[in-house]
Interface confidence: low
């Protein structure tokens, strides 16, 4: 057999036995002659150095460049490859010799004690136990212990080769402490030497640098970088660092194993790089590489070295932030600086503290922005070493998509008396104000009653054929008033009104307001009835604990069977062709109420009394009447709002005043509450009595003292009282100057 590439000028050495494999018996003599074209050498098993005493290599007597290898009384251990080669070349001829020794079928190692096999617990890796055979066709199995297990070649991943040994997936014997090969010859068992199994790990799970990023120092400071490698068990790790200034004299490297919890399936290694006093040349990329032999993992971090501490705002720092109500707003403080600055946020000059709605840190986060968050936010950066300060102002503008105030107040099914003039209102609050408010309409019957147009509980108007109010053909005559602007509850609102000249047909009206961040709409069910009429006695909006009556009046000649109901909270599941308006269709959503009937000359009147009205009494009340002729049911709906009782409060303070004799004092005391409180004034804790100089106006809200005198000086108290209690504010009026003598004196 030939090894290597033939050269142009040299033929391969030629062996006297022209075979790849030679099988001879033990105790016989092995002799092979090798001839070539230049100086030759022999290599043989077990002793590659050529100093084996049993082996004799002699020059041939009959020619140059010829050597004969002779081994008398060969033994099984002489099995192996015999190689004749030209010195200092790759050109060689090889013959594999099996010395059949049935008493010792395995070739013993040099030490003849035991061998070591190193394995990794990798599913895909195989290991070779080098139990070579002196016989090529042995039946060899592998024994592993403890516990004892035997592995037999399976023609696949488990195999034995006399020239190589026993091959087996490494994980199969990773449990074992030792293994050996066993051959059966004529019912006799022969064993190879023992091989100790050493499980060697290789897997590195990760390499972590700490600090991992954003490392900044100034010249002269100490840099400490920790590199931690986490590995599987039975792993050894070599660390290697790469860094900018490799000739650093103050560099120190310490490697050590870290303790892990007992039973842990992992090992930890730590390498610490320390540079005592960094210079600008130490700035750059630091890379830590951990190697287990079979695997290398790296991690890098950039170290920035500054000449001295500093702080400045980054170029991306915003000056205007726009947001829509409800959004999460994030205003990052973008800065350049070392060390990281202390960051303090202020709103309109007042420091901001973090709470559940706002987080004031590197990033100012407002969880759900509201209008009151509008304003100027100042961020102040302070360098903790140099105390240098930098400030920047960010204006936050919060936009509000159109909100229609009446949307939550008006009943979705109010009814209107036939022929009356009605005004529908949409009060819109939006920032910026709406750039338009448009009105649309459509006939009530167009919006439903088609089986294919079934409505749903949460969207009672699935109609899409809205018409502009300019086109009121077939509907009610309409006029849209010019938008008004009003300050309502301290907010600038846009009020759009639609006047229906005569309520002739039932329709739906929709106002739609649009601004730059959104749209809002309100659908008004304008259900026109010729039927009964509802009035409230004594007041449109009763306060808690007051009594109120709902009067349902119907023409006796037209209607009968008047009944009061209250609209319940659980609507019907809507099926084909059903509509929530008119309410009459869904009587099962109504609760029948007790009422009192009496009559006048033309009408039947059904009165429903609410004694001591409570907030639970709020809701939609339905009066049902039946047409005497057609038996058709007519419904009228009225929404009842019960005002909550509120104890008196006085808005604004009375200010202490200093006034000169003869001047006038005018003060006002505005009180709110439900029921509305009575206002009284006191001077020095005594009721203030009106006279020519003391005037009380607007239900005692405004106090005027004309041509003040010295005796008007004192403590003035405004007190607002109702059944729910009193509220008061006080102020001291000082009167300066001398009292002029009057003629009377």
């Amino acid at each position: 057999a030939s090894v290597g590439l033939p050269s142009v000028s040299l033929d391969l050495p030629r062996l006297s036995i022209q075979k790849d494999i030679l099988t001879i018996k033990a105790n016989t003599t092995l002799q092979i002659t090798c001839r070539g074209q230049r100086d030759l050498d022999w290599l043989w098993p077990n002793n590659q150095s050529g100093s084996e005493q049993r082996v004799e290599v002699t020059e041939c007597s009959d020619g140059l460049f010829c050597k004969t290898l002779t081994i008398p009384k060969v033994i099984g251990n002489d099995t192996g490859a015999y190689k004749c080669f030209y010195r200092e070349t790759d050109l060689a001829s090889v013959i594999y010799v099996y010395v059949q020794d049935y008493r010792s079928p395995f070739i013993a190692s040099v030490s003849d004690q035991h061998g070591v096999v190193y394995i990794t617990e990798n599913k895909n890796k195989t290991v070779v136990i080098p139990c070579l055979g002196s016989i090529s066709n042995l039946n060899v199995s592998l024994c592993a212990r403890y516990p004892e297990k035997r592995f037999v070649p399976d023609g696949n991943r488990i195999s034995w080769d006399s020239k190589k040994g026993f091959t087996i997936p490494s994980y199969m014997i990773s449990y074992a402490g030792m293994v050996f090969c066993e051959a059966k010859i004529n019912d006799e068992s022969y064993q190879s030497i023992m091989y100790i199994v050493v499980v060697v790990g290789y897997r590195i799970y990760d390499v972590v640098l700490s600090p991992s990023h954003g490392i900044e120092l100034s010249v002269g400071e100490k840099l400490v970088l920790n590199c931690t490698a986490r590995t599987e068990l039975n792993v050894g790790i070599d660390f290697n660092w790469e860094y900018p200034s490799s000739k650093h004299q103050h560099k120190k490297l310490v490697n050590r194993d870290l303790k892990t919890q007992s039973g842990s399936e992992m090992k930890k290694f730590l390498s610490t790089l320390t540079i005592d006093g960094v210079t600008r040349s130490d700035q750059g990329l630091y890379t830590c590489a951990a190697s287990s032999g079979l695997m290398t993992k790296k991690n890098s971090t950039f170290v920035r070295v500054h000449e001295k501490p500093f702080v400045a705002f980054g170029s991306g720092m915003e000056s205007l932030v726009e947001a829509t109500v409800g959004e999460r707003v994030r205003i990052p403080a973008k800065y350049l600086g070392y060390p990281p600055p202390e960051i303090k946020w202020y709103k309109n000059g007042i420091p901001l503290e973090s709470n559940h709605t706002i987080k004031a840190g590197h990033v100012l986060t407002i969880m759900e922005v509201s209008e009151r968050d509008t304003g100027n936010y100042t961020v102040i950066l302070t360098n903790p070493i140099s105390k240098e300060k930098q400030s920047h102002v960010v204006s936050l503008v919060v936009y509000v998509p159109p909100q229609i105030g009446e949307k939550s107040l008006i009943s979705p099914v109010d009814s209107y008396q036939y022929g009356t003039t009605q005004t529908l209102t949409c009060t819109v609050y939006a920032i910026p104000p709406p750039h338009h408010i448009h009105w649309y309409w459509q006939l009530e019957e167009e919006c439903a009653n088609e089986p294919s147009q079934a409505v749903s509980v949460t969207n009672p108007y699935p109609c899409e054929e809205w018409r502009s109010v300019e086109d009121f053909q077939g509907g009610n005559k309409i006029e849209v008033n010019k938008n008004q602007f009003a300050l309502i509850e301290g907010k600038n609102k846009t009020v759009s009104t639609l006047v229906i000249q005569a309520a002739n047909v039932s329709a739906l009206y929709k106002c739609e307001a649009v601004n730059k961040v959104g749209r809002g709409e309100r659908v008004i069910s304008f259900h026109v009835t010729r039927g009964p009429e509802i009035t409230l006695q004594p007041d449109m909006q009763p306060t808690e604990q007051e009594s109120v009556s709902l009067w349902c009046t119907a023409d006796r000649s037209t209607f009968e069977n008047l009944t009061w109901y209250k609209l319940g909270p659980q609507p019907l599941p809507i099926h084909v062709g059903e509509l929530p308006t008119p309410v009459c269709k869904n009587l099962d959503t109504l609760w029948k109420l007790n009422a009192t009937m009496f009559s006048n000359s033309t009408n039947d009147i059904l009165i429903m009394e609410l004694k001591n009205a409570s907030l639970q009494d709020q809701g939609d009340y339905v009066c049902l009447a039946q047409d005497r002729k057609t038996k058709k049911r007519h419904c009228v709906v009225r929404q009842l709002t019960v005002l909550e009782r509120v104890a008196p409060t006085i808005t604004g303070n009375l200010e202490n005043q200093t006034t000169s004799i003869g001047e006038s004092i005018e003060v006002s005391c505005t009180a709110s509450g439900n029921p509305p409180p009575q206002i009284m004034w006191f001077k020095d804790n005594e009721t203030l009595v009106e006279d020519s100089g003391i005037v009380l106006k607007d239900g005692n809200r405004n106090l005027t003292i004309r041509r003040v005198r010295k005796e008007d000086e004192g403590l003035y108290t405004c007190q607002a009282c109702s059944v729910l209690g009193c509220a008061k504010v006080e102020a001291f009026f000082i009167i300066e100057g001398a009292q002029e003598k009057t003629n009377l004196e």
Epitope: S452, S456, I574
Partner: antibody, heavy 113, light 111 residues
């Protein structure tokens, strides 16, 4: 044209679970109440469950409460029925219906060991 | 046991008329004008024929009509045709805990 297509039926062992889906098209899904109705082999129609357009109002047949859950995803125009602890008597063709005016072709659920 | 009672089967010859009844209580058929009728051919999905007692969806022949008296609703089919052979189910809104209830179904055979 209104189209309702059920899917998710199949063979399941007693005690097992299935999730039926109904893909809707050809109408404004988010405006309509939706229903599941079933029909056991050779038997009549049995109302199973209803859900309003915004999922605010949900109703189940008394015999199924606690085992079946109806839900919908208006963004995906889809109706669902999650069926747990299935029994042999739940074997049926399950129909999805829009307000009982439009029906799908049904999906067969077989509960058998 | 269905809450609404229907005859199991009815039959008539082509051209004749037939009426299918659906009996409930004051909590369902008698209490609400929400009675519907469905036609179902074998292997097919049900089809709405009548809603709210007597209303016909577009596309349904005027040979089909619905009515109600007290607690009983009726479906009438005039001028019977072979394609009318099918199962017919009634349903009603009900004020019990389940809002919908079906009848047991009636098999209509056209002789």
């Amino acid at each position: 044209e209104v189209q309702l297509v059920e899917s998710g039926g199949g063979l399941v062992k007693p005690g097992g679970s299935l999730r039926l889906s109904c893909a809707a098209s050809g109408f404004t899904f988010s405006s309509y109440s939706m229903n599941w109705v079933r029909q056991a082999p050779g038997k009549g129609l049995e109302w199973v469950s209803s859900i309003s357009s915004g999922s605010s109002y949900i109703y189940y047949a008394d015999s199924l409460k606690g085992r079946f859950t109806i839900s919908r995803d208006n963004a995906k125009n889809s109706l669902y029925l999650q069926m747990n602890s299935l029994r042999a008597e739940d074997t049926a063709v399950y129909y999805c219906a829009r307000d009982f005016g439009n029906w799908g072709q049904g999906t067969l659920v077989t509960v058998s060991s | 046991q269905s809450a609404l009672t229907q005859p199991r089967s009815v039959s008539a010859s082509p051209g004749q008329s037939v009426t299918i009844s659906c009996t409930g209580t004051s909590s369902d058929v008698g209490g609400y004008d929400y009675v519907s009728w469905y036609q179902q051919h074998p292997g097919k999905a049900p089809k709405l024929m009548i809603y709210e007692v007597s209303n016909r969806p577009s596309g349904v022949s005027n040979r089909f009509s619905g009515s109600k008296s007290g607690n009983t609703a009726s479906l009438s089919i005039s001028g019977l045709q072979a394609e009318d052979e099918a199962d017919y189910y009634c349903s009603s809104y009900t004020s019990t805990s389940s809002p919908v209830v079906f009848g047991g179904g009636t098999k209509l055979t056209v002789l």
